[in-house]
C-alpha cells in the first residue's frame, strides 16, 4: 500500500477520507487504527457501528469520529482539535471476522497554527510540498497538492 499524507493544523479539525470498492467490502464494518511502531500492531482507535446498516451514523472515541458511506464507498475519519501527538501513521481498515484488510495507509502531519501568535511563529515554517514516489499529500479539505505547491501561504 502507498501512503497518503493528510495535513492539518493544530487546534483545528482534520478530515481523512478512505475510498474503497463498495461491492468488494459490502457488509463489512470499518475501523481506524494507529500504527504503534514499524513492526508493532495497529491499535484500534474507533470503528463503525456494530450494525453495518447503521454505518452512516458517526461514532466517536474521544476526539476521533468515524462514518461510512457504504454505497458510495468512502470511509471518513474526523480528528477534532488536532494535537501534535496526533501526528503519526494510521490505517483505514475493512473488518471481516478477526481479520482486517488495509484500505489505505495514512500519514498525518500536524502543522502549527500560523495565526496563533503565542508560539506558532516560533514553531511553524511553510515547507514546499513535493511529489513523492510513495506518498500523496492532501489537505484537510481533501484536495490533492500539485507538485511544487506550498501547503499554506508563507507568512511575512
Amino acid at each position: 500500500h502507498n501512503t497518503t499524507v493528510f495535513q492539518g493544523v493544530a487546534g483545528q479539525s482534520l478530515q481523512v477520507s478512505c475510498p474503497y470498492d463498495s461491492m468488494k467490502h459490502w457488509g463489512r464494518r470499518k475501523a481506524w487504527c494507529r500504527q504503534l511502531g514499524e513492526k508493532g500492531p495497529c491499535q484500534r482507535v474507533v470503528s463503525t457501528h456494530n450494525l453495518w446498516l447503521l454505518s452512516f451514523l458517526r461514532r466517536w472515541n474521544g476526539s476521533t469520529a468515524i462514518t461510512d458511506d457504504t454505497l458510495g464507498g468512502t470511509l471518513t475519519i474526523t480528528l477534532r482539535n488536532l494535537q501534535p501527538h496526533d501526528a503519526g501513521l494510521y490505517q483505514c481498515q475493512s473488518l471481516h471476522g478477526s481479520e482486517a484488510d488495509t484500505l489505505r495507509k495514512v500519514l498525518v502531519e500536524v502543522l502549527a497554527d500560523p495565526l496563533d501568535h503565542r508560539d506558532a511563529g516560533d514553531l511553524w515554517f511553510p515547507g514546499e510540498s513535493e511529489s513523492f514516489e510513495d506518498a500523496h499529500v492532501e489537505h484537510s479539505i481533501s484536495r490533492s497538492l500539485l507538485e511544487g505547491e506550498i501547503p499554506f501561504p508563507p507568512t511575512s
Epitope: 504503534l36 511502531g37 513523492f132
Partner: antibody, heavy 115, light 107 residues
C-alpha cells in the same frame, strides 16, 4: 535495516553557518518524519526540530530564528542549517527518524564552533 | 514547553539488582512518553514508547509504567551492559523535550 549517517564540517567559525546532511539508507525517506537532536559534551539531549514528508517543518523555539531544515527525496537526504553559531552550539549532532518516537538514530557528528 | 524532571541524577547499583528510574512531567503528556538508553560514545537507543510499550528487540527486563504525570522505567535485574545514562522524552506537545538524564552506575 534503516541506517542514518550524518555528514558535514566538524569545525565552524563563530557567526558562520553550520550545515549538516543526514543520508538515509536501507529504506525510503518518504512517508516518515525526520528530526535533528544535539548533545553538548557531558550534557543532555536537545531536540532541534523535525521535517515532515511534505517538507513542512516544526522548530524548537530555542533555535527557531537560526534554523532551516530541508529534504531531498531524490537523494534520500535531509539537511540542517544553523546560522550565526556561537560556542554554545558546540555539540554532537544526531539525525533520527521521528515517526515512532526516535527509533533510528545516526551515530552522531561532533561540531565544534571555534575560531 | 513541557519540562521533564528525572530522578535520581545518579543511581549506584550492582549487577542483578533492580533499578527504578523516575520521570515527572510539568504537565500532562498523556502516555506520549519514551525512554532511551545511551551508552558512552553511542547514540541513544529507544527502549520504551508510549510509556509502556517495549521497542523491537528490547529485553523483557525493561518495563515502563505511568501514573498521571509520573513515569517509571524499571530494569528488573541489571545486566553489565545496562549501566548507562537513561533519558525520558515527551512527544505530547511541541517542542519535544527530554529529561536531563539518570546515570546508572556500578556500585
Amino acid at each position: 535495516q534503516v541506517q542514518l549517517q550524518e555528514s558535514g564540517p566538524g569545525l565552524v567559525k563563530p557567526s558562520e553557518t553550520l550545515s549538516l546532511t543526514c543520508t538515509v539508507s536501507g529504506g525510503s525517506i518518504s512517508s516518515y518524519y525526520w528530526s535533528w537532536i544535539r548533545q553538548p559534551a557531558g550534557k543532555g539531549l536537545e531536540w532541534i526540530g523535525l521535517i515532515y514528508t511534505s517538507g513542512s517543518t516544526i522548530y524548537n523555539p530555542s533555535v527557531k530564528r537560526r534554523v532551516t531544515m530541508s529534504v531531498d527525496t531524490s537523494k534520500n537526504q535531509f539537511s540542517l542549517k544553523l546560522t550565526s553559531v556561537t560556542a554554545a552550539d558546540t555539540a554532537v549532532y544526531y539525525c533520527a527518524r521521528d515517526l515512532f518516537y526516535f527509533d533510528y538514530w545516526g551515530q552522531g557528528t561532533l561540531v565544534t564552533v571555534s575560531s | 514547553e513541557i519540562v521533564l524532571t528525572q530522578s535520581p541524577a545518579t543511581l549506584s547499583l550492582s549487577p542483578g539488582e533492580r533499578a527504578t528510574l523516575s520521570c515527572r512531567a510539568s504537565q500532562s503528556v498523556s502516555s506520549y512518553l519514551a525512554w532511551y538508553q545511551q551508552r558512552p560514545g553511542q547514540a541513544p537507543r529507544l527502549l520504551i514508547s508510549d510509556a509502556s510499550n517495549r521497542a523491537t528487540g528490547i529485553p523483557a527486563r525493561f518495563s515502563g509504567s505511568e501514573s498521571g504525570t509520573d513515569f517509571t522505567l524499571t530494569i528488573s535485574s541489571l545486566e553489565p551492559e545496562d549501566f548507562a545514562v537513561y533519558y525520558c522524552q515527551q512527544r505530547s506537545n511541541w517542542p519535544w523535550t527530554f529529561g536531563q538524564g539518570t546515570k546508572v552506575e556500578i556500585k
